[in-house]
Interface confidence: medium
């Protein structure tokens, strides 16, 4: 037996992080996003739960809703009506899936200082929102959409087809929520509040995933979710628009699907209102390499929505799938005709293009061997966007302004030189027409949120600088973080290395690879974090590395689309390549290398452990995918095509974890899964376990009863990280 090794940070008054610090969230940071209500006014929920109004120009601030009013209904969230007469208060939050939840809503009348009585809202409500003007309310209850012209009015029922697990109006079904819309809602008000667009999802023919929820009862409950796995029947989707001024006169009008899309299975991908009578819908073929953007107009004479062929814009990928993770959405200019959109240029880098008439005639606005990430706002004279251009680091985000009034347009980096060491990864929140904006910096130093003038970019004030966190970290020995790149053949891989305090290159350290590696993801980011792996480096003396291999995002389509139709190959290969390079650096103990990952990362870590290379002593897979046939249609098929003989069934079959069961014989494997995982079903781990048993391979496993994909209940999370820590320390012969 090898002697146990204990890592002791040397001669320092500062203490190492403990696992308890991580589990208690002792070193969590705060961000500050203004809730904009005009060009120069915003709301924010204070530490003590008062809702405070701020006017940037007059410098006034006052409480518009007291914490006692919030507390009277146990409210945890709020929403002010645009006419500022009412506030909805949200309580009884009950999580459903990733974004969806139900809640109870109360309407508070700010004028009268009391709750609106009469025609109170039903409970629980699946989604509720104000119109953009005035105080109309749209809400979804029991899968149907209702409308109130004023909070105290009786509701008008817009849809009648809603049925649990069958037909969803105004809210997405499971697969659309998780893999397409990334929202809990599927309805959108027109800018003037006249029209309400919504989607109807018909899941009647979708196969059901059923799993037990054990609870406390004598018999477990069965959870049933319509969930299309790869190749299965998909939701049937229709988009309707209703005139909310006279909803009973005309009824909802269906918006036509473009001919080239409707000819085979398709998806709705997003809806953008352009003006009060113009709407833009995006559609996607089931084989997700063709996307169509369709601009539709309201024709008063026919009282119908027209989507002429000459207003259809096609986006197609010849090397992979359309878009990044999702197809990008358009940012329309003031003329309500032309728009800006991010898509791949001729070199395969995602860049901003200006489309006036046809996509073929698009004018490229940004270019280079980097990528534009997101368009925040288009005003009359400026376009604000984020990119990873600055200094060539793909894992950074800076905010840029392009002056579109000028010819040629001039570009300015708003954030690149503000707090260069502390801040390299930004997002932003703009007031309606970008008169003011907030910048939120996520690191690599302590996060900080600041308010800026939208004309001059001058900083007006610091909104949140995490002073308390800074003070509490003063006596903590944090590891050193490096972001660098390594080259192998013609490929470049960016990696993040977290090095123990007092790291000494002449010594040997155990190495833990943390992997996600899913298509269009990014792990190597210049952000601040104090989490489990920070603790492992700080206290246990483990070197941690994260590597962005092929298939990851923001480095061009050649790198991104390398994994198209062959998931589980290059993602694993590139992790192995990186490990070999790390060994060559001289400070890694080759006998003590591990890998761990969650979800897609659990899939990659499992395949890496089963690669037969002998590089890894042990590894952990939490909630892994084990076969792409078990996962959601929209996701699996985007990257893998269909699991049919004439398409890609062969690779679906040979990319499973089960197919490599024999290769786990020489590694220590810990397999973990929540039994109530609605996303990556427990089935995935059950099949891995079955294959390992059939192959007579020993392994360790842990299930978490009634836990979902996040294994996030306090007790479960503590148990999970404690268990994984013990496993790793045992693997690395580190004494407890």
């Amino acid at each position: 037996l090898r002697p146990s090794r204990v890592y002791k940070p040397e001669g320092n008054t500062k203490r190492a992080l403990t696992l308890k610090d991580i589990l208690n969230g002792t070193f969590s940071y705060k961000t500050y996003f203004p809730n904009w209500i005009s060009e120069q006014e915003y709301l924010h929920q204070s530490e003590d739960d008062n809702i405070v109004f701020y006017n940037i120009e007059t410098r006034e601030s006052y409480i518009i809703l007291s914490n006692s009013t919030m507390k009277s209904v146990n409210a945890t969230d709020y929403g002010l009506s645009p006419d500022r007469q009412f506030v909805y208060l949200e309580s009884d939050y009950s999580k459903l899936w990733r974004y969806s939840y139900t809640a109870t809503y109360y309407i508070y009348d700010l004028q009268n200082g009391e709750f609106v009585r009469g025609y109170e809202l039903p409970r629980p409500i699946q989604y509720l929102c104000w119109s953009p003007v005035g105080s109309k309310l749209a809400y979804v209850y029991q899968n149907n959409i209702y409308l109130k012209q004023r909070p105290g009015d009786p509701p008008f029922q817009i849809t009648y087809t809603g049925r649990e697990n069958r037909i969803f109006n105004g809210i997405p079904d499971w697969v659309y929520e998780e893999e397409m819309l990334a929202t809990k809602y599927a309805l959108w008000w027109s800018p003037d509040g006249k029209f309400l667009a919504y989607v109807e999802f018909n899941d009647s023919d979708i196969p059901i995933i059923a799993y037990s929820y054990y609870g406390d009862g004598q018999y477990p409950r069965t959870i049933n979710i319509p969930y299309p796995k790869a190749g299965a029947k998909n939701p049937v989707v229709r988009v309707f628009i209703v005139d909310t001024t006279y909803p009973h006169h005309v009824g909802p009008m269906e918006v036509p699907v473009p001919e080239m899309i409707a000819s085979s299975d398709y998806y709705f991908s997003w809806l953008t209102w352009v003006s009060s009578e113009r709407v833009c819908l995006q559609w996607l073929k089931r084989v997700q390499n063709v996307s169509v953007l369709s601009i539709c107009d309201f024709r008063e004479d026919w009282h119908a929505w027209e989507c002429p062929k000459n207003q259809e814009h096609v986006e197609e990928s010849r090397t992979g799938w359309a878009g990044g993770f999702f197809v990008s959405t358009p940012a329309f200019s003031q003329d309500a005709t032309s728009y800006y959109k991010i898509f791949s240029d001729k070199d395969g880098y995602k860049h901003i293009h200006y489309i006036k008439d046809t996509v073929e005639n698009a004018i490229q606005i940004t270019s280079g061997k980097w990528e534009a990430i997101y368009i925040f706002r288009v005003t009359q004279d400026s376009l604000f966007y984020s990119s990873n251009e600055f200094e060539g680091y793909p894992g950074r985000r800076n905010i840029y302004r392009i002056s579109i009034g000028n010819s040629p347009p001039s570009k300015k980096c708003v954030t690149c030189h503000l707090r260069k060491e502390r801040c390299q990864y930004y997002t932003a929140s703009f007031s309606y027409k970008a008169k003011y904006y907030a910048l939120v910096c996520y690191g690599p130093g302590l996060p900080i949120s600041t308010l800026h003038d939208g004309r001059t970019d001058q900083e007006i004030q610091v909104l949140e600088e995490n002073k308390e966190l800074e003070n509490s970290l003063r006596n903590i020995q944090l590891p050193k973080v490096e972001i660098k790149k390594l080259k192998d053949g013609g490929l470049t891989f960016w990696y993040k290395m977290i090095l123990p305090p007092q790291f000494d290159r002449s010594k040997k350290y155990p190495l833990l690879i943390q992997v996600y590696g899913g298509p269009c993801s990014q792990s190597v980011k210049s952000v601040f974090a104090v989490n489990w792996i920070t603790y492992l480096a700080s206290k246990e003396g483990i070197v941690i590395a994260l590597v962005d291999g092929r298939g990851t995002a923001f480095q061009g389509d050649k790198f991104l689309h390398a994994v198209y139709r062959k998931l589980g190959v290059y993602e694993v290969e590139d992790q192995l390549t990186a490990v070999r390079k790390f060994i060559e650096m001289g400070f890694i103990d080759e006998e003590r290398i591990a890998i761990w990952g969650w979800s897609y990362g659990g899939y990659v870590s499992s395949l890496a452990l089963a690669s037969g290379t002998g590089l890894f002593k042990c590894g952990i897979a939490v909630a892994p995918v084990s076969s792409w046939e078990y996962y959601a249609s929209i996701y699996s098929e985007r990257f893998m095509g269909l699991p049919t003989k004439d398409d890609n069934l062969e690779h679906y079959k040979n990319s499973t974890v089960m197919a490599r069961a024999e290769y786990f014989r020489n590694v220590d494997y810990l397999l973990i899964h929540g039994t109530a995982d609605d996303n990556v079903h427990f089935q995935n781990s059950a099949q891995i376990a079955k294959a390992l048993v059939n192959a007579q391979v020993d392994f360790q496993a842990m299930w978490y009863s009634d836990q979902n994909h996040g294994i996030s209940s306090g007790r479960s999370q503590n148990h999970l990280y404690t268990h994984m820590t013990h496993f790793l320390k045992q693997c690395f012969s580190l004494s407890d």
Epitope: G251, E254, A262
Partner: nanobody
């Protein structure tokens, strides 16, 4: 080839009823892009769209002059649209055309040959 064939016209007394039918072939009336309208033309008067329907959603629209008296409907299994005309008046006398359009084209591009409705005592 797209064809719309109307039937059901004729002579009727004021206050009477008629039901016009429009059988479509060559395109599917239950597609979300398809609208069927009834348009009437009378000598010396402007052409008038009296009613239209989007069969996929059941969304309907009527001219003010016929609201409450005329009902447009469709039977997607027969690929046929109908105009039920009640409480007919002399001013409803016209040639009634069934018109079809697909909303990615402007205007009604498919027309039937027309059926005459005469309201007279």
């Amino acid at each position: 080839e797209v064809q719309l064939v109307e039937s059901g016209g004729g002579l009727v007394q004021p206050g009477g009823s008629l039901r016009l039918s429009c059988a479509a072939s060559g395109f599917n009336i239950k597609d979300s892009s398809t609208y069927i309208g009834w348009v009437r033309r009378a000598p010396g008067k402007e052409e008038e769209l009296v009613a239209r329907i989007q069969c996929s959603s059941g969304s309907t629209r009527y001219a003010d002059s016929v609201k409450g008296r005329f009902t447009i409907s469709c039977d997607t299994s027969k690929n046929t649209a109908y105009l039920q005309m009640n409480s007919l008046r002399a001013e409803d006398t016209a040639v009634y055309y069934c018109a079809g359009r697909q909303s990615y084209n402007y205007g009604y591009i498919y027309w039937g040959q027309g059926t005459t409705v005469t309201v007279s005592s």
